[in-house]
Interface confidence: medium
């Protein structure tokens, strides 16, 4: 499943370079592995925001796959809990580009560790 | 892996409508988006559009919009496909199917028949 | 709506031999292109994902190949089973639309 993620993320890539989308996304650069499941859940949120800004059907369809694949390896893993992360809204804003890449980054960590 | 059972054949007649059912099992209801595609007796394969079974957002192609209502039960993870003012070009076998942009599984199809 | 073109319409050929299917899309759809075998009277089987990944049990004589625009399924060996009609189906923009299909006969 995070590998369909990966591609669904670069078809959104491909998708936005097309467009001029200006919105700054919540973005978690260097995440820490304990942290990663909190910051995976604030991609996810944040990815919701491209699908509105962009008004594209293709994104949107594409957003919504994304997530449902993404929770559903989510789940897989249980109901982890962890503390002392970062709320998604204090985390550094920055733009679509910089945040789709961080996004593919905390998925291939997920792949790297299932 | 996912299973995905329809219901039975209909007919019906010009301008009606018709909700066929496509009910989830073996696989987590929530873990894949439904994709409703059709196809005319003899005829290629048609993609309609698309349901979260989690949030019950939904994604309809342009040829549909206005005709088409996606809905979800949750308590019977079942999903419905209702096609309002059917003519007699909406004869088809319905399929529901899991996935949006790549269609894994698929329902066995139900054979919708428009006729006066 | 992007348009999605297959030939040959029918085919008729030996078990054993090598089978090319091709797609081609009215526009450049990178790699979003999918394959799907159909048999009568049955549901499609996905066979191919972006372009040239094989589904998860999908014999390896399946292989698909092409970006932009020009796509190509390819069977290396037909076997028996193989007979049967196959869509490709372009993912990259809405409504995802299909090829016409492309019918495998036996000679």
């Known amino acids: 499943n995070w590998v369909n993620v990966i591609s669904d993320l670069k078809k959104i890539e491909d998708l936005i370079q097309s467009m001029h989308i200006d919105a700054t996304l919540y973005t978690e650069s260097d995440v820490h592995p304990s942290c990663k499941v909190t910051a995976m859940k604030c991609f996810l949120l944040e990815l919701q925001v491209i699908s509105l800004e962009s008004g594209d059907a293709s994104i949107h369809d594409t957003v919504e796959n994304l997530i449902i694949l993404a929770n559903n390896s989510l789940s897989s893993n249980g109901n982890v809990t962890e503390s002392g992360c970062k709320e998604c809204e204090e985390l550094e804003e920055k733009n679509i580009k910089e945040f789709l890449q961080s996004f593919v980054h905390i998925v291939q960590m997920f792949i790297n560790t299932s | 892996q996912v299973q995905l059972v329809q219901s039975g054949a209909e007919v019906k007649k010009p301008g009606a409508s018709v909700k066929v059912s496509c009910k989830a099992s073996?696989?987590?209801?929530?873990?894949?988006?439904i994709s409703w595609v059709r196809q005319a007796p003899g005829q290629g394969l048609e993609w309609m559009g698309w349901?979260?079974?989690?949030?019950?957002?939904?994604g309809y192609a342009q040829k549909f919009q206005g005709r088409v209502t996606m809905t979800r039960d949750t308590s019977t993870s079942t999903v419905y496909m209702e096609l309002s003012s059917l003519r007699s070009e909406d004869t088809a076998v319905y399929y529901c199917?899991?996935?949006?942009?790549?269609?894994?599984?698929w329902g066995q199809g139900t054979l919708v028949t428009v006729s006066s | 709506d992007i348009q999605m073109t297959q030939s040959p319409s029918s085919l008729s050929a030996s078990v054993g031999d090598r089978v090319t299917i091709t797609c081609q899309a009215s526009?450049?759809?990178?790699?979003?292109l999918n394959w799907y075998q159909q048999k009568p009277g049955k549901a499609p089987k996905l066979l191919i994902y972006?372009?040239?990944t094989l589904q998860s049990g999908v014999p390896s004589r399946f292989s698909g190949s092409g970006s932009g625009t020009d796509f190509t399924l390819t069977i290396s060996s037909l076997q028996p089973e193989d007979f049967a009609t196959y869509y490709c189906?372009?993912?990259?923009?809405?409504?995802?639309?299909f090829g016409q299909g492309t019918k495998v006969e036996i000679k």
């Open positions: 199917a899991t996935g949006i942009t790549m269609i894994g599984y």
């Open positions: 073996g696989d987590t209801f929530s873990s894949y988006a």
């Open positions: 349901m979260n079974p989690n949030s019950g957002n939904t």
């Open positions: 526009q450049d759809i990178s790699s979003y």
């Open positions: 972006a372009a040239s």
């Open positions: 189906q372009q993912s990259y923009s809405t409504p995802y639309t």
